[in-house]
């Protein structure tokens, strides 16, 4: 049967993003409509047809455009994605003979981790703090020269859609740690990044 091929995309916040749909059919459509999927009913964003060209709905006027003007292959581009743009989008190809054939492409917005790593001595112990803020939520791990060192982790969700994960390494005999390297590892979207800290006696 006739189908539409799509691909989900993950793009960084405040960058452009494109979603593409391809009608796997011998014939082009009469009109292509892009809609955003919403809880109640989909919201029309933009249409393209030979008769009327590109027609963008007012709410999307400065946000998107159709960057591939095709009736078999259609691409919409968001100029500068925000968290509100995250979600799933439907492309509807209104075809002669077979009606509306739809596909769904989903857009996920990510924010690269911002990491801070610092340490603080007290009289009898050393606290090393690693904090990573990202979207989706990052994970924080420690690589230390010896085992048995305790750590505690706190997760905080922010209104802007990012999540902070803060892990504190509690070292009871700080003298042994002086001059040694501690590595905070941040895992985000399948990539692990090492942040190194050498403890100096303050």
């Amino acid at each position: 049967q006739v189908q539409v091929v799509t691909q989900d995309e993950r793009e960084q916040l405040y960058t452009p993003a494109s979603l593409k749909c391809s009608l796997q059919n011998a014939q082009e459509a009469l009109i292509v409509t892009w809609q955003k999927k919403k809880a109640v009913s989909p919201e029309n964003m933009v249409t393209f047809s030979e008769n009327h060209g590109v027609v963008i709905q007012p709410a999307y006027k400065d946000k998107i455009n159709i960057t591939q003007l095709g009736l078999q292959n259609s691409t919409i581009t968001f100029w500068n994605i925000t968290l509100e743009d995250e979600g799933c989008y439907m492309c509807l190809f209104n075809t002669f003979g077979f009606g509306k054939i739809s596909g769904t492409a989903c857009l996920t917005v990510y924010v690269q981790p911002i990491v801070s790593l610092h340490y603080k001595f007290s009289e009898d112990h050393l606290n090393i703090t690693c904090s990573a803020t990202a979207r989706p939520a990052p994970m924080v791990f420690w690589k230390v020269p010896r085992s048995g060192i305790e750590n505690s982790t706190v997760t905080l969700s922010h209104p802007n859609g990012t999540t902070s994960v803060t892990s504190i390494l509690h070292i009871k005999d700080p003298k042994n740690q002086v001059g040694k390297e501690v590595i905070c590892q941040v895992l985000h979207l399948g990539t692990v990044t090492d942040f190194k800290q050498t403890v100096n006696k303050g």
């Epitope: 059919n25 014939q27 459509a29 003979g97 077979f98």
Partner: antibody, heavy 117, light 107 residues
């Protein structure tokens, strides 16, 4: 040059089936939809259904309640329309045509199907 | 199903006349309408598609207009070969349906 050549006239008894062929030549068969319409004596044209030869996807007028089947043989560049459980009101001229989207340009010569006991 | 109603059902005119045939849909069909000409014993011939686009090879005296529910086929100056039956077809919604036809005859 483009041609759609239909099979010859048929006389059938009520309850029987008829299969009309439409042989295409002069173009790439899978690039165009093949459609079937019919016209009973003194009546308006009636859309029966169509097929996209590329995928073999077809769509039928539900008025025919499953009595119509449209198929194609891409190797023979031929489309077929089969109508079963024939009744007298199916007596009509059956036409195949081709379309690129909604652009209809070539038609077969028509096939008269007479249903009579 | 969408009903297509043509008017008039028959029309008498002379060579050189300007003729208008209308087609009304029972619901909005956007611009998804074609016009066909048919002569006795012959297959239909496509004249106009998408309400106002002329099919290649069709004389420019034929024109189409309208959108939504009301459509018009105009022949600006009738020629002898134009006497035939004309049908509209909607293809906005399946099943696609034809009008009942307008028979154009010599006055």
């Amino acid at each position: 040059q483009v041609q759609l050549v239909q099979s010859g006239a048929e006389v059938k008894k009520p309850g029987a089936s008829v299969k009309v062929s439409c042989k295409a030549s002069g173009y790439s068969f899978t690039d165009y939809i093949i459609l079937w319409v019919r016209q009973a004596p003194g009546q308006r044209l009636e859309w029966m259904g169509h097929i996209d030869p590329y995928y073999g996807s077809s769509n039928y007028n539900l008025k025919f309640k499953g009595r119509v089947t449209i198929t194609r043989d891409t190797s023979a560049s031929t489309a077929y329309m089969e109508l079963s459980s024939l009744r007298s009101e199916d007596t009509a001229v059956y036409y195949c045509g081709r379309s690129k989207r909604d652009y209809f340009d070539y038609w077969g010569q028509g096939t008269l199907v007479t249903v009579s006991s | 199903d969408i009903q297509m109603t043509q008017s008039p059902s028959s029309l008498y005119a002379s060579v050189g006349d300007r003729v208008t045939i209308t087609c009304k849909a029972s619901q909005d069909i956007n611009s998804y309408l074609s016009w066909f000409q048919q002569k006795p014993g012959k297959a239909p011939k496509s004249l106009i598609y998408r309400a106002n686009r002329l099919v290649d090879g069709v004389p420019s005296r034929f024109s189409g207009s309208g959108s939504g529910t009301d459509f018009t086929l105009t022949i600006s100056s009738l020629q002898p070969e134009d006497f035939a039956t004309y049908y509209c077809l909607q293809y906005d919604e399946f099943p696609y349906t034809f009008g009942q036809g307008t028979k154009l005859e010599i006055k």
